[in-house]
Each structure stands twice: as structure tokens, then as C-alpha cells.
Interface confidence: medium
Amino acid sequence: QRFAQAQQQLPLESLGWDVAELQLNHTGPQQDPRLYWQGGPALGRSFLHGPELDKGQLRIHRDGIYMVHIQVTLAICSSTTASRHHPTTLAVGICSPASRSISLLRLSFHQGCTIASQRLTPLARGDTLCTNLTGTLLPSRNTDETFFGVQWVRP
Amino acid sequence: QRFAQAQQQLPLESLGWDVAELQLNHTGPQQDPRLYWQGGPALGRSFLHGPELDKGQLRIHRDGIYMVHIQVTLAICSSTTASRHHPTTLAVGICSPASRSISLLRLSFHQGCTIASQRLTPLARGDTLCTNLTGTLLPSRNTDETFFGVQWVRP
Amino acid sequence: QRFAQAQQQLPLESLGWDVAELQLNHTGPQQDPRLYWQGGPALGRSFLHGPELDKGQLRIHRDGIYMVHIQVTLAICSSTTASRHHPTTLAVGICSPASRSISLLRLSFHQGCTIASQRLTPLARGDTLCTNLTGTLLPSRNTDETFFGVQWVRP
């Protein structure tokens, strides 16, 4: 019985399965386009199993290929608001270490008030992911409208 | 040889890998905003491996963290139709048991005719997921335009 | 020690975990609506572990259920461009073998300049996936704006 349990735990411990789903905490100060995230069961349905938060940014703890996904909804928004405040753009990227800095995922809102996408990308232990929202519109903090997550897929 | 087969089956049986991809069956009666889903190889490319359908709603059979994804396309739609009928909103949530009722994912159509998104969320055995489409526009039943699915990711 | 290593490799080798993330190489000639993809570490963050490219189209090497995802951004685009050139549509489907030809995922741009979606679908060894972009607008080749990938999920 103990052996069977150990078998079950193998993928979680040795193979990874690192996973995180975050909710929006706050936007950055005036000149900082980054969104700051939070996660944990006390906050609702957000969680971190493996990755960690470093000053509101997501830091990877295990090398591998990850599925990165995000949805951001603008708070006070109609299609006319979105087009009038264009360009409002969301970019997800590796922001540190600086030597690995790169944009992974980029979307503009145009006449919509929500963007949602996902992609597979290799990430390394220590990579910190930042999500930059440029423009004057504010994101909704509703947990079903704005969220950001990663899922380890394979080494 | 039998041992190798048993090894292969371990993750499917003991670790889960529950997965479902559903196609739209029909919308609800007048006061019921829920979409009713169907799945199975006889219907095309939809399937249920683990989760079950309960009166067109998806019921979870295994505790864990799931990737939930959805795409809904409005049937007779242009950007002017979509904006004229605004707000048309799609919400995915746990609708039963009532004690766990919560909205997991919400998107508005604004001037678009398709919404698509995905998120990671903890689900428990017995959770039933409902997809509520509010507004007067009808969803397309084309299987490449409207679909809803879940994938077990880890315990 | 060697046994532990073999254990870790089991899921990768015998259970699959085939995965690919591609970047846009080029569009097809006049009458060919297909997008042509490329992948490999020399190109940046794209890769193929299992699936292969056949003249820019993605060929599956292992039977199973896959998560297919795509994002396509139009190159010189505003909401007025997108609506003026409507319909611009993106479809992902099995294009060969001809006996299995089917559309898996379809989205229109309407007044937006980016589409992004994902779905679970059964695929078989030898299936080739094609991505057809119909309309007169051209896709962006920026690797954070346009990408296409698959992830093996379970047998």
C-alpha cells in the first residue's frame, strides 16, 4: 500500500506538475505598467504549487515546458471606451533574469474589453514572468474576469 | 509485457487524467440561461473520459486541479449585431452543490461574435459546471465554433 | 539510480507527452489559404518534441487526445481595418489524410485584430493539421503575436 502511494506521488514530486493560478492584486505605480498578482486558498480559488510570487510577479521553480495562460478584463469598459483608449495592450514576458528577457505573448484590446490567450513555452528555474498592461484603462479585479496561470507540461 | 502495460495504465487509472470535450446540444427554455451540452464518439469529436453529463451539465468525478476551456460563437452575428444586443455574456461556474456555487470564468461579447478562454481551477468530485449565456442572441451549434471542455491537471 | 532515471523517462517515452509550439514562417501562394509554420530552438522559443513539420504543416506522430491552441494577429490592423476586410476567418483542421479531413476550430476576426483559442481533440498518428486564414489581411510573424501548438494530453 505504501509503495502504491509512493508511485502516485512520483509525478508530483520528481516529474514536476508545477502549477499556479493567480488573481489580480493591484496595478503598479504611475510609471510601472506591471500587474501585481496574488494567490493562495485564503483568497479564493487561486493557488501556487511550485512557482512562487516575488513582489507580485511569478517566479518559476522548475525547468520545463509550460502552458502559460491569461485573461484580463478592463474594469469600466465598452467597445467605444476600448477603441477610444487604443492602444491598450497586454504583454506577458520573462522580465528577469535580464539575460533571458523576452515577450512571450502579446494582445491588444482594440474594440474588446477582454483578452484571453495561452501558449506553450520553455521556462527555466528562476525565470520571473511579468504581465504589462499599457494604456490608461484599469483592469477588473473580479476573480472570474482577470487571472493568470502556468502549468508545467513536460521537461 | 503485462507489467509494462500496467505501468502505462497507472497515470490513467490511479492518477486521473479525467478529460471531457463537449459540443452544444441546445439552449435552455425561456428563463434558463444555461447551455446544454452533449458528448460521445457517435456525435463526432466530443468525448467524456471520467466526467459525466447530468441533464446536459458537466459533473466532475475526481478531485483535482482542472484546466477548464470554452469557446462560444453566436449564430447569426456581425459586430453590429453583437454591439446592438450588448450585454451578451458567457459565464462558466460551479452551479451545484449550492454550497460551492461560484463563477469561474466570465466574458462579454461586446463587438465580437466569439469568446474563447481557459483557466486552471480546483474542482471536487460532484461539482457540476454550468455555462450561462445571458442576452438574446443564440449560440452556433457548429462543433468547430462552440465547445466546452475540462482536463484534469494534477491532484 | 539508473532505474529511477528510467522511471522518470517512462511518461515521456511510453506515455507520450508529445508537444509542439510553432511560429509563423510564411503564408501560402495566391490560392493557398494555409499558413506555413516553422519550429526549433534555433528560431527562438518554438520546438517540436514528437510531432513533425511536413512542408510547413504539423504532422502528428502519436495517437491520443491533444490540446490544440492557436493565436493569430493580423499584421497592419485596426478595428476599422478588420471590419472593412470582414470576413477574415481562421480555421484549424485535419487536412490529411483526406478520409479524416475535418474542421476542428474556427474563428472570425470581426472588429478585432487577434484571435486566440484552444480545444481538446482526438488525433491519430499521421494526421496533418492545417491552419487556413481566409481574407485579404496578412498575419503578423512576431513570435509573441502569432503561434500554434499542440500538447498530448492522454491516450
Partner: nanobody, 116 residues
């Protein structure tokens, strides 16, 4: 817990002005943003103006240039100054506060009627 009490609603002629107040009490240190919503008869509740803890502000298109949201931290109060009022501004106006854990708190609402 956060308690919110609105005041300042009433009947006003088109083109007139009103100032709504929302006084917050309780766990106010936990508040991230405060907002004014409105709900006209038979319509969905809509977000009108939003002010977040670092001072950023957004307005709905329909009120931009006419309404101003502000706050007095010393009094734990948020205001909505409404000028050039129109009949379509008639609604029940609700004060909303959201804490850092994205929990919503609501006031009881105050009626604003714009009519000649």
C-alpha cells in the same frame, strides 16, 4: 467587514447637479478600490466611476466630463460630483468597495431622479 452608507440623492432638473457621498467604516485599511455603480429600472447595474488606492481613476464613457469621483481619506469618504445631469442618469446609485482579496461590499443605494 466594511460598511458603506450613501447619501446625497434626490430629485433634480435636467442640467442640474448633485453630490453623492459614501462613508466607509469598519476594516477600511483593507480597501483597494471604491466605485460608484448605478442601476436604472429594468436595466443591469453598471459601473460609473472607479478610484483605486494609488489614486488612479476611470469613468464610464456616458459620464466622462460630467461626473467627478474623489475621496477624502481623513473622513473615509468617497464622493461623486454629478454635473449637467440628464434624464438618462436617473437610477439608484450604489457605492462599492473592494478589498485586497477582491471581496465586494455594497451600500444600500440612493435614488437619483432627473426630471423637469
Amino acid at each position: 467587514q466594511v460598511q458603506l452608507v450613501e447619501s446625497g440623492g434626490g430629485l433634480v432638473q435636467p442640467g442640474g447637479s448633485l453630490r453623492l457621498s459614501c462613508a466607509a467604516s469598519g476594516s477600511i485599511a483593507s480597501i483597494y478600490h471604491m466605485a460608484w455603480y448605478r442601476q436604472a429600472s429594468g436595466k443591469q447595474r453598471e459601473l460609473v466611476a472607479l478610484i483605486i488606492s494609488d489614486g488612479k481613476i476611470n469613468y464610464a464613457d456616458s459620464v466622462k466630463g460630467r461626473f467627478t469621483i474623489s475621496r477624502d481619506n481623513a473622513k473615509n469618504t468617497v464622493y461623486l460630483q454629478m454635473n449637467s445631469l440628464k434624464p438618462e442618469d436617473t437610477a439608484v446609485y450604489y457605492c462599492n468597495a473592494q478589498n485586497w482579496a477582491t471581496r465586494d461590499y455594497w451600500g444600500q443605494g440612493t435614488q437619483v431622479t432627473v426630471s423637469s
